[in-house]
């Protein structure tokens, strides 16, 4: 298995390699096979990354930042492979690497441009602040700066506040949207153009449900086929908002097919789950069950939020006793 990196061929002996933060990559270089092979990799034509000659590595003058992070494909050198295996790339490793190869009859140079991207899985959060409701799309660590777009009922909206914090090696970004009083569906897309990776968050508000005390309620949660791929690992969480904070009722992990239920009156239908329907039942309702119920289906590529508002009213019997 090759580490995650992909090559883009550009003219003049120069290739672009794109890697992910903390992952391993290969900087490619090939040459016409020959004897007395000498291989030198240098960064920005100044710092020694890796040296090989007289049939072995010579790393005495290797720049300390590359210590224990580089190696060649030693069994492949005789076949003209001078590629460098590079461990745990960081954003500081971005730049131009030059491979110098000398054989008994020739010298070649290959330039490789390394670009490093970061895309820690974003999240879509639903928050209440006083009387206002907000959707927040956020990504804890991303590089380069991503493109964030919002849609309301599938129509792009221009309002796009972005709260950005830059650290040494990446950005942390929050994009809040005030959705107070709206029944629309919302979609937020965060795109990392370098890694060609897109994440989508989708929020849907269902019609309010009015129930009587001691009844049960069925709340639907079915993923939209556009985003959902059952083959991909995902997590489903049902939570209830009480006085501004969410408490988790239950969650399901697709990888282990485990269901963890924190509320005894909560039930999930196993057969429906197998059909990717995560609707739930809450039995024996009481007045304190009134509130907002949130179903969150999340994977590396999307978050689907479905919100239900439930009003539990006193039953006639309870009312007459008062």
């Amino acid at each position: 298995i090759f580490p995650l990196a992909f090559f883009i061929y550009v003219p003049m002996n120069e290739q672009i390699v794109i890697g992910r933060l903390d992952e391993d990559i290969i900087l490619p270089s090939s040459f016409e096979r020959g004897s007395e092979v000498v291989i030198h990799w240098k960064y920005q034509d100044s710092y020694k990354v890796h040296s090989y000659y007289k049939g072995s590595d010579h790393l005495e003058s290797q720049d300390p930042r590359y210590a224990n992070r580089t190696s060649l494909f030693y069994n492949e050198i005789q076949n003209g492979n001078a590629s460098l295996f590079f461990r745990r790339v960081s954003l500081l490793d971005e730049g131009i690497y030059t491979c110098y190869v000398g054989t008994a009859i020739q010298v070649i140079t290959n330039k490789v441009v390394l670009k490093v991207g970061v895309f820690l899985t974003p999240v879509m959060k639903y928050e209440k602040r006083n009387t206002n409701s907000f959707l927040i799309c956020s990504v804890l660590s991303v590089y380069p700066r991503p493109i964030i777009t919002w849609k309301m009922d599938n129509t792009p909206i221009s309002e796009n506040n972005m709260e950005e914090t830059g650290s040494l090696d990446s950005f942390s970004i929050n994009s809040p949207l005030n959705i107070t009083g709206s029944n629309s569906s919302y979609e937020c897309t965060i795109e990392n153009s370098l890694l060609k990776q897109t994440w989508t968050g989708r929020w849907t508000m269902k019609d309010g449900l009015h129930k009587m005390q001691s009844e049960h309620v069925s709340l639907s949660c079915q993923p939209v086929n556009d985003y959902f791929s059952p083959n991909q690992d995902f997590k489903v969480t049902w939570s209830r908002m009480k006085s501004g904070t969410f408490s988790v009722l239950a969650y399901y992990l697709s990888s282990s097919q485990n269901t963890i239920i924190n509320e005894s009156r909560f039930s999930w239908n196993k057969e429906l789950i197998n059909q990717s329907d995560f609707s739930m039942n809450l039995m024996d309702l009481n007045l304190s069950d009134s509130g907002e119920y949130l179903c969150n289906i999340s994977s590396d590529e999307y978050t689907l939020l479905t919100i239900h508002t439930v009003h539990v009213e006193p039953s006639q019997e309870t009312a007459s006793h008062n």
């Epitope: 002996n13 007395e36 008994a104 020739q106 010298v107 070649i108 140079t109």
Partner: antibody, heavy 121, light 106 residues
Framework: EIQLQQTGPELVKPGASLRISCKAS????????IVWVKQNQGKNLDWIEK????????TYNLRFEDKATLTVNKSSTTAYMQLNSLTSEDSAVYYC??????????????WGQGTSITVSS | DIVMTQSHKVMSTSVGDRVSIICKAS??????VAWYQQKPGQSPKLLIY???TRHTGVPDRFTGSGSGTDFILTITNVQSENLANYFC????????FGGGTKLEIK
Amino acid sequence: EIQLQQTGPELVKPGASLRISCKASGYSFTDYIIVWVKQNQGKNLDWIEKINPYYGTTTYNLRFEDKATLTVNKSSTTAYMQLNSLTSEDSAVYYCARWDYVSTLFAMDYWGQGTSITVSS
Amino acid sequence: DIVMTQSHKVMSTSVGDRVSIICKASQDVGTAVAWYQQKPGQSPKLLIYWASTRHTGVPDRFTGSGSGTDFILTITNVQSENLANYFCQQYKRYYTFGGGTKLEIK
């Protein structure tokens, strides 16, 4: 101090053979290639052959095939070039030079002072 | 074989002038070109490698440029001690030298 010290001038008869030496000092002898270069009366430079002291392997210029034989003595850090079947065409100054591949120069960064050879009867 | 051609055998210049010595390769050699200076009665001395990198101790009045097939060694503010022969050399495949350009001071 890095030095390549060559033997002095030689006057030899046509058809003879001659061995000239190049004593290297001030660096790790097996880490650098020794290249032998000819400079004729017209001041043109031509590489003849090179030797990798670590492997003992040589690579020659086809124009000088069978003209030179290169050897090294690692313990005395000396490179030798034997010139065979000398003719007046071989009258020239012969240089040994260090070819640096260890620091990515890939160039001849140090040269001996040259050995002048005159082939004449 | 790759042929290196220095079309000017001799170039005349005055002290303080700027002079450009030209070298052409018969095929693409990338930047695998070195320049050497040889003063009368001395061995060649490395000035430039990889077409444009100055060797240790070489004054910055010497500048190398070019890639592919066309290379230039430029000497600015020429001094009398710069009277010498200048050779280009390719090391892309084996080694070949140009015929040399003799710099004369008027």
